[in-house]
């Protein structure tokens, strides 16, 4: 139903709403500099912006919510800009027995959303 | 291992930090009068709620993503509350052809997590 | 299990970009988070690296190569590639794809293709 | 960028003995996190690169453990405990401390 399409367009202006950047982190600004041995730069892709009416809704749950922050903004909080999928990093690290390659399917987002 | 465990000890004070919380919303509060006949009022339960660093982390992501913040606060948003599993709701509303009941699995917000 | 393949054309006329693809089967490019980097061997010479990109197009080059050089990669396509413009005779070699971690650990490598920079 | 040298540049080996290559970088490729930041990499006869070893000591996934990788700082050595014909080739070190990743010129193996 229309009611429920949320919209694609940033009324805020450029860069305003959700949406995805990078940010540049190393090991040490992670705090990972003891366990992971590679990569040491990470490429960190984020979710920043804000989440006017309607704007890039996650599900019914968040329209309602942008909705009740309207009608109560002290009682309940706008939606968020939040990861809606993510894409996998490998990240060498120590382990008991010496050194293993492991997968991290939730550490970069790759898509954002408002919930 | 350790680095990766969030906690679940709000440092805050009680009731700050990322929670569940009940809002009671009529259908004319969601501008939905017009297509759902029931519930006419709604129990709403929403992810309301602070995210200090480490607090109900959702993942990976979200672990950096509080400690990037504290680093980078102006570019890094700190995690928020936003709802880990939701719990279904059927609505009664009308349809071209009459009333219909429908389950929505997206609407009620079960658990709560920080992203 | 997962295999690198270059193509591209042989024969470069100097002056010239040199473009060449590299196409990742049995597994995708944007799984798995690795860096996928390109390096070059001379007729009988040692081992270069040229540079590498990660899933999300964000490029490492080498700084003696860097004003010439451009990867990008086209996950829809399952494939990187190399541009190395304004080539000389020096850029003569055998260019291998590979996969990495960072730009260490290259367990996986293409075959090779070998381009020859001639009039 | 680091500079990479390796010793000898040519080796002839006989089946059965053990050999020894020598990589000496031009700055520590000791990480602060205490792991050394080189790889060794096989290129047989009309093949690509295989990985050896990586992190100074650590044999990549099917590498026979008659390959092994020692040393610290600014000096490195791959042994072959027992070399066998198949082992024959070119072997590279590379560091990877910094970018961009460096290679030594290689080390010829072959058989008496």
């Known amino acids: 139903s229309a009611h429920l399409h949320p919209r694609d367009s940033c009324p805020l202006g450029p860069g305003r709403c959700c949406h995805l950047e990078t940010v540049q982190a190393t090991l040490e600004d992670l705090g990972w500099s003891d366990w992971v041995l590679s990569p040491r730069q990470l490429q960190l892709s984020m979710c920043v912006g804000e989440c006017p009416h309607l704007y890039r809704s996650a599900n019914t749950h968040a329209l309602i919510k942008a909705r009740l922050h309207g009608l109560q903004p002290d009682r309940v909080p706008a939606p968020c800009c939040v990861p809606s999928s993510y894409t996998p990093v490998v990240l060498m690290h120590r382990t008991d027995s010496g050194v293993s390659l492991q997968t991290y399917d939730d550490l970069v987002a790759q898509g954002c959303h408002c919930a | 291992s350790a680095h990766l465990h969030p906690r679940d000890s709000c440092p805050l004070g009680p009731g700050r930090c990322c929670h569940l919380e009940t809002v009671q919303a009529t259908l004319e509060d969601l501008g939905w009068s017009d297509w759902v006949l029931s519930p006419r009022q709604l129990q709403l339960s929403m992810c309301v709620g602070e995210c200090p660093h480490l607090y109900r982390s959702a993942n990976t992501h979200a672990l950096i993503k509080a400690r990037l913040h504290g680093l980078q606060p102006d570019r890094v948003p700190a995690p928020c509350c936003v709802p880990s599993s939701y719990t279904p709701v059927v609505l009664m509303h009308r349809t071209d052809s009459g009333v219909s009941l429908q389950t929505y699995d997206d609407l009620v917000a079960q658990g709560c997590h920080c992203a | 299990q997962v295999q690198l393949q270059e193509s591209g054309p042989g024969l470069v006329k100097p002056s010239q970009t040199l473009s060449l693809t590299c196409t990742v089967s049995g597994g995708s490019i944007s799984s798995g988070g690795y860096y996928w980097s390109w390096i070059r061997q001379h007729p009988g010479k040692g081992l270069e690296w040229i540079g590498a990109i990660v899933y999300s197009g964000h490029t490492y080059y080498n700084p003696s190569l860097k004003s010439r050089v451009t990867i990008s990669v086209d996950t829809s396509k399952n494939q990187f590639s190399l541009k190395l413009s304004s080539v000389t005779a020096a850029d003569t070699a055998v260019y291998y794809c590979a996969r990495g971690v960072e730009y260490q650990h290259f367990s996986l490598w293409g075959q090779g293709t070998l381009v020859t920079v001639s009039s | 960028d680091i500079v990479m040298t390796q010793s000898p540049l040519s080796l002839p080996v006989t089946p059965g003995e053990p050999a020894s290559i020598s990589c000496r970088s031009s700055?520590?490729?000791?990480?602060?996190?205490?792991?050394?930041?080189l790889d060794w990499y096989l290129q047989k006869p009309g093949q690509s690169p295989q990985l050896l070893i990586y992190?100074?000591?650590n044999r990549a996934s099917g590498v026979p453990d008659r390959f092994s990788g020692s040393g610290s700082g600014t000096d490195f050595t791959l042994k072959i405990s027992r070399v066998e014909a198949e082992d024959v080739g070119v072997y590279y070190c590379m560091q990877t401390l910094e970018a961009p990743p460096t290679f030594g010129g290689g080390t010829k193996v072959e058989i008496k």
């Open positions: 992190l100074g000591s």
């Open positions: 700055q520590s490729l000791l990480h602060s996190n205490g792991y050394n930041y």
